[in-house]
């Protein structure tokens, strides 16, 4: 029968957990991405921010997974209005922030 969307969200959370736990050298060579308002923007904005990162196999699966929760094609900079005061943070911190946000969504049952 139909599988609750929470199953897919759990997969994404587990992938982010793996990234944070297996991190040895600086994630994506310390690449910086735009800090975003996750509450206001959600999956598409998170994907938009990470789209700027290329050549980083560690977050490749995360980028692809996020696209499955965003209804349209995302191109870099599409959601610049939702960047937090033009602030950039390391990918590692971005992943941690995203993980906390998704865990909160999961607990509250907000899957989409």
């Amino acid at each position: 029968g139909p599988v609750p969307p929470s199953t897919a969200l759990r997969e994404l959370i587990e992938e982010l957990v793996n990234i944070t736990q297996n991190q040895k050298a600086p994630l994506c060579n310390g690449s910086m991405v735009w800090s975003i308002n996750l509450t206001a923007g959600g999956f598409c904005v998170a994907l938009d921010s990470l789209t700027n990162v290329s050549g980083c196999s560690a977050i490749e699966k995360t980028q692809r997974m996020l696209s499955g929760f965003c209804p349209h094609k995302v191109s870099a900079g599409q959601f610049s209005s939702l960047h937090v005061r033009d602030t950039k943070i390391e990918v590692a911190q971005f992943v941690k922030d995203l993980l906390l946000h998704l865990k909160k969504l999961f607990r509250e049952g907000q899957f989409n």
Partner: antibody, heavy 123, light 107 residues
Framework: EVQLLESGGGLVQPGGSLRLSCAAS????????MSWVRQAPGKGLEWVSA????????YYADSVKGRFTISRDNSKNTLYLQMNSLRAEDTAVYYC????????????????WGQGTTVTVSS | SYELTQPPSVSVSPGQTASITCSGD??????TCWFQQKPGQSPVLVIY???KRPSGIPERFSGSNSGDTATLTISGTQAMDEADYYC?????????FGTGTKVTVLG
Amino acid sequence: EVQLLESGGGLVQPGGSLRLSCAASGFTFSSYAMSWVRQAPGKGLEWVSAFSGSGGSTYYADSVKGRFTISRDNSKNTLYLQMNSLRAEDTAVYYCVQDGLGPYFYNYGMDVWGQGTTVTVSS
Amino acid sequence: SYELTQPPSVSVSPGQTASITCSGDKLGDKYTCWFQQKPGQSPVLVIYHDSKRPSGIPERFSGSNSGDTATLTISGTQAMDEADYYCQAWDSSTYVFGTGTKVTVLG
């Protein structure tokens, strides 16, 4: 390691039926959408059907709509394709493919393919 | 129904650049994937999200997508790149594959 193993192919007469199976391993099967893609001898790739992981939605190519039915058994990590009213033009290698996550799974990219099972429709 | 059109064949000398186009109405608005298929083998994803390479795919493979055309570029083409290539996109609840392009590496 993610693996997909198709079975159930064979020779069938026009108008006949066949059920293909795809045994999946190495990933959380229930979370992912799955597709069937076919390739007629000497021809290109043709998508046949998809079954989403998150919402249980099914999708079909116009060429098989009303004749083929996709289904899945998450407890057995298995994808199926029930093919009825088979025609000569359904002759092809049928591939089982791992799709993406979430309601917009099609954005992910089909990066895991089985080896395929051959279906021949002939009298 | 939506259609993706590719040139039937492209020939390239070793070390040179091969470009394969994929044309479809407003294709630039959609994510495009590219697959490589060698004789007797299953297809392999070489580009997703228009221009991203999955892990394990050589850097010589690159992609772009805008307007009505997506392009797969193979820089410094090698003999092992000889294969059929297919573009793919999603439109109106269906996947659509391109017509396919046979890349021949000369010599």
